[in-house]
């Protein structure tokens, strides 16, 4: 099966790599603009230069292109706790991230929020906090994991999943009491 190509991909595939087909004359292949620039005017004829202009402040192109306009720079979402890792340049978009000891939770493909890494109090770090994943904790005896925090088994209600994890502790306590009464 031949993959479906859009009109632009079809047009570009006629020309060698790094060139695109002139929109008004399909016998002419124009050189694409370098990253950091955009297409101001198509090349007038074969072997003649494409008129490319540098992106203005606040915009960029990250790869060779024949875009009529540069792309607007992204803004880091302060309300999501994001901070700017590197500012936008003519050839690279803004890079946003999280502060130290935070991880990214992606709400959707292009939207993330920064959350503090779990400290694993009353437990140990099983897997360290990473850029896109919270710390994975293992709890000490007498504690169970709830919402990635180690909670005392005294807070374990019968209906919760923690009964399985806290049961040995409860049995041990009963066993000690029984041996003490003989």
């Amino acid at each position: 099966l031949v993959p479906h190509l859009g009109d632009r991909e079809k047009r570009d595939s006629v020309c060698p790599q790094g060139k695109y087909i002139h929109p008004q004359n399909n016998s002419i292949c124009c050189t694409k603009c370098h990253k950091g620039t955009y297409l101001y005017n198509d090349c007038p004829g074969p072997g003649q230069d494409t008129d490319c202009r540098e992106c203005e402040s606040g915009s960029f192109t990250a790869s060779e292109n024949h875009l009529r306009h540069c792309l607007s720079c992204s803004k880091c979402r302060k309300e999501m706790g994001q901070v700017e890792i590197s500012s936008c340049t003519v050839d690279r978009d803004t890079v946003c991230g999280c502060r130290k000891n935070q991880y990214r939770h992606y709400w959707s493909e292009n939207l993330f929020q920064c959350f503090n890494c779990s400290l694993c109090l009353n437990g140990t770090v099983h897997l360290s906090c990473q850029e896109k994943q919270n710390t994975v904790c293992t709890c000490h005896a007498g504690f169970f994991l709830r919402e990635n925090e180690c909670v005392s088994c005294s807070n374990c209600k019968k209906s919760l999943e923690c009964t399985k994890l806290c049961l040995p502790q409860i049995e041990n306590v009963k066993g000690t009491e029984d041996s003490g009464t003989t």
């Epitope: 709400w107 959707s108 990635n148």
Partner: nanobody, 120 residues
Framework: EVQLLESGGGLVQPGGSLRLSCAAS????????MGWVRQAPGKGLEWVSM????????YYADSVKGRFTISRDNSKNTLYLQMNSLRAEDTAVYYC?????????????WGQGTLVTVSS
């Protein structure tokens, strides 16, 4: 077919409270983060709050932090928004939304909305 049905809106005095509900059907509710979005008269859409699949991680717009609480009951396929200390500027149509896992849009399905009017 994905369906999101909001309820609980109405007229309330400033300082009052309301609890919005959203009954979800037509998709596996437990697999998706959910959210509330609002549109005030003559204004654009504003994200209000979001909650992850297990109800652990939440997001609140600065304008509602400390006053609104989002929650979900996965056993009932229902999303909630508890709104306290309501202000006139909270007047809007509130939409329940399913958060998209892919693509550039955060939300891929919306409900019909429920009107919240804060007025004395």
């Amino acid at each position: 077919e994905v369906q999101l049905l909001e309820s609980g809106g109405g007229l309330v005095q400033p300082g009052g409270s309301l609890r919005l509900s959203c009954a979800a059907s037509g998709f596996t509710f437990t697999r998706y983060s959910m959210g509330w979005v609002r549109q005030a008269p003559g204004k654009g859409l504003e994200w209000v709050s979001m909650i992850d699949t297990r109800g652990v991680r939440t997001y609140y717009a600065d304008s509602v932090k400390g006053r609104f609480t989002i929650s979900r009951d996965n056993s009932k396929n229902t999303l909630y928004l508890q709104m306290n200390s309501l202000r006139a500027e909270d007047t809007a149509v509130y939409y329940c939304a399913k958060i998209s896992q892919f693509g550039s849009n955060a939300f891929d399905y919306w409900g019909q909305g429920t009107l919240v009017t804060v007025s004395s």
